[in-house]
Amino acid sequence: AESHWCYEVQAESSNYPCLVPVKWGGNCQKDRQSPINIVTTKAKVDKKLGRFFFSGYDKKQTWTVQNNGHSVMMLLENKASISGGGLPAPYQAKQLHLHWSDLPYKGSEHSLDGEHFAMEMHIVHEKEKGTSRNVKEAQDPEDEIAVLAFLVEAGTQVNEGFQPLVEALSNIPKPEMSTTMAESSLLDLLPKEEKLRHYFRYLGSLTTPTCDEKVVWTVFREPIQLHREQILAFSQKLYYDKEQTVSMKDNVRPLQQLGQRTVIKS
């Protein structure tokens, strides 16, 4: 049987054979991959990149959250959507997950001017069906998925909006475990609206196999702030394996080449 994909830290800490990022298959060896380093001064301003409109993001819900063996994932089940932000159509929210380390400055997937952050949160959306502009795009869309990426840094205050998620982590230490979070809204997790005006945009891929090159990325300039203990909870409470021997951390794909692509900014 073919080995399952994993992160470098899992291969280093476990006896199970698995495929580390440089050996990932599927589309992962192509040339329009994510994540990337964003050189902020090289990104050209594009006036078409306006504000986002969030629908259902403010609704308090009891979300299901699970340990999927690679990250912690909230199931959003089309209960929210986004439009605007220079996107070609409305997009339905599918899931939210995060990437992190057990140390500052190395838990994010994207970097800004070479700087990594403590964590990165991805809200994954799919384009609403029947909204592609032409036949070719409908068959081979490079923007079928819209990911909103939020960098996370340490702040001095507890971020109350994240507490329902942080508190749920204790209930899902092992892969395939799931639980219900205390009632919260997606808006609780986001920075204040005025901080969502500045973002970077490029076309790339999923950062996990099969690394499909069909993602329109939005990386927000302003980071979310979490308290030290909230950040550390992810690496302290979650495990990659059912035996709970390998702490879940460093679930971060290495940076990929930008190549011929361009990054634009709002």
Epitope: D102, L103, Y105, K106, E115, A154, L232, S235, Q236, S247
Partner: antibody
């Protein structure tokens, strides 16, 4: 009372290795990062690296990646730094410090370990 | 990496005088600057965090200000026990870096 107590002064030969310790007390050892800082005589402060005592995760200043190895023993609440292939440039005072917030200031410091490398 | 420049290298003051130390970052770092005092043969002691936030147990004569790239540590009435080297440290981005220090001496 938070305290970081470092091991005593060392005189070692060039080319050898040495390991210094930093024993923490007065707080939950695994909840805070431990940083290591170098200070050469009459000079400023230079960051070496950081360890998360809870997980053993480490991160180094590029300059010290092949010089320093950081470890921690949760059972004794002690952090260690091993320095290898010692030269006279490694003669310095080495401090351990506790990081007050994640990625921020160092709120408590050890008294320092003086290392002299000489033949 | 972010460069931190402290000035002047040496400050000579008389007891009771007000004194200010300057710290400049090579790029904007918000308020992620922290100030330390290191007396001769001692270890650094945290005086001010996040540019202007006071630390429990530190005398109120110590204060800090600034944001972006320019920061100041002030002692409003110098006492003899304040004779030391003062360092600033940025924690905005990795690796954390320190200034070269300003030595405070008595006239």
């Amino acid at each position: 009372d938070v305290q970081l107590v470092e091991s005593g002064a060392e005189l070692v030969r060039p080319g050898t290795s040495m390991k210094m310790s930093c024993k923490a007390s007065g707080y939950a050892f695994t909840n805070y990062l431990i940083e290591w800082i170098k200070q050469r005589p009459g000079q400023g402060l230079e960051w070496i690296g950081v360890i998360n005592p809870g997980s053993g995760g480490t991160h180094y200043n590029e300059k010290f990646k092949d010089k320093a190895t950081l470890t921690a023993d949760k059972s004794s609440s002690t952090a260690y730094m091993q320095l290898s292939s010692l030269t006279s440039d490694d003669s310095a005072v080495y401090f351990c410090a506790r990081e007050g917030d994640y990625a921020s200031r160092f709120d408590y410091w050890g008294q320092g370990t003086t290392l002299t490398v000489s033949s | 990496q972010i460069q931190i420049t402290q000035s002047p290298a040496i400050l000579s003051v008389s007891p009771g005088e007000r004194v200010s130390f300057s710290c400049r970052a090579s790029q904007s770092i918000g308020t992620r600057i922290h100030w330390y005092q290191q007396r001769t043969n001692g270890s650094p002691r945290l005086l001010i965090k996040y540019a202007s936030e006071s630390i429990s147990g530190i005398p109120s004569r110590f204060s800090g200000s600034g944001s972006g790239t320019d920061f100041t540590l002030s002692i409003n009435s110098v006492e003899s026990e304040d004779i030391a080297v003062y360092y600033c440290q940025q924690s905005n981005s990795w690796p954390t870096t320190f200034g070269a220090g300003t030595k405070l001496e008595l006239k």
